[in-house]
């Protein structure tokens, strides 16, 4: 399914404290498959991969094609 990389943005929407680490929420949302179609505005966000929207954070993330890495799947994985 390729590499999953999350955009650095976390809106903090489900976090009580703005500086709270949302990693637990993110992990849980990934485990439960809490993703939706990326909004149209992010159609071209992922360069070499597909976009999905992290419901818990209301932010785009990219699932990279094989051989690509980076928040937007913009870099070739030299170790691939």
């Amino acid at each position: 399914d390729g590499n999953s990389t999350r955009s650095p943005e976390t809106n903090g929407l489900l976090c009580g404290d703005p500086e709270e680490n949302c990693a637990a929420t993110t992990t849980q949302s990934k485990r439960k498959g809490h993703f939706s179609r990326c909004p149209k505005q992010y159609k071209h966000y992922c360069i070499k991969g597909r976009c999905r929207f992290v419901v818990a954070e209301q932010t785009p993330s990219c699932v990279c094609d094989e051989g690509y890495i980076g928040a937007r799947c913009e870099r070739v994985d030299l170790f691939y």
Epitope: S7, P8, E9, N11, E19, Q58, T59, E74
Partner: antibody, heavy 116, light 106 residues
Framework: QVQLLESGGGLVQPGGSLRLSCAAS????????ISWVRQAPGKGLEWVSH????????SYADSVKGRFTISRDNSKNTLYLQMNSLRAEDTAVYYC?????????WGQGTLVTVSS | DIQMTQSPSSLSASVGDRVTITCRAS??????LGWYQQKPGKAPKLLIY???SLQSGVPSRFSGSGSGTDFTLTISSLQPEDFATYYC????????FGQGTKVEIK
């Protein structure tokens, strides 16, 4: 606590330029998308632009495309909006807001008046 | 561009009233919708995201519903601090706001 503080507003003539700044504190600025949203006097809200955390993804409203440029300096925890070829209809309070799609924290705004 | 139309533009209500504001998108936006409250001279405050999820710290008397093109913000029992202007915002195709609904004291 999260704080966003805009500055740089003022009176400018049509066709002129202005650069707004937004100083952020109370959160890890470099992890978040940030946006500019404006509000003309007595009017509603209008999204202007957003920028991702790494400065490699930006989008603009059609009304400002080609005239405004959003940028950020993560080392200074600061967001910028360079506004060129200003028009009377750009007169508004300009807010910076945390987020790219939704805006969970806002600054107090800075007033930009474009008039001769 | 997606246009967002709110109704009514203004309404008068009393403390304790149930208030409903509607927002219609010119095309389907799934559930990519937020609601904000703004008081005079202040910045907007996020109330609801993803059409129906309550933002942290927002009182439970606020609720949102809808999907596709038709959305609703409901205040179950209006409180004195709720008199303000409310905006919907879609974030499917870029970001656009409704024109606002002013909730005034009857």
């Amino acid at each position: 606590q999260v704080q966003l503080l805009e500055s740089g507003g003022g009176l400018v003539q049509p066709g002129g330029s202005l650069r707004l700044s937004c100083a952020a504190s109370g959160f890890t600025f470099s992890r978040y998308w940030i946006s500019w949203v404006r509000q003309a006097p007595g009017k509603g809200l209008e999204w202007v632009s957003h920028i991702d955390s790494n400065s490699d993804w930006t989008s603009y409203a059609d009304s400002v495309k080609g005239r405004f440029t959003i940028s950020r300096d993560n080392s200074k925890n600061t967001l910028y909006l360079q506004m060129n070829s200003l028009r009377a209809e750009d007169t508004a309070v300009y807010y910076c807001a945390r987020g790219g799609s939704l805006f969970d924290y806002w600054g107090q705004g800075t007033l930009v008046t474009v008039s001769s | 561009d997606i246009q967002m139309t709110q109704s009514p533009s203004s309404l008068s209500a009393s403390v304790g009233d149930r208030v409903t504001i509607t927002c219609r998108a010119s095309q389907g936006i799934i559930s990519y919708l937020g609601w904000y409250q703004q008081k005079p001279g202040k910045a907007p405050k996020l109330l609801i995201y993803a059409a129906s999820s309550l933002q942290s710290g927002v009182p439970s008397r606020f609720s949102g519903s809808g999907s596709g093109t038709d959305f609703t913000l409901t205040i179950s029992s209006l409180q004195p601090e709720d008199f303000a202007t409310y905006y919907c915002q879609q974030y499917d195709a870029l970001n656009t706001f409704g024109q606002g609904t002013k909730v005034e004291i009857k």
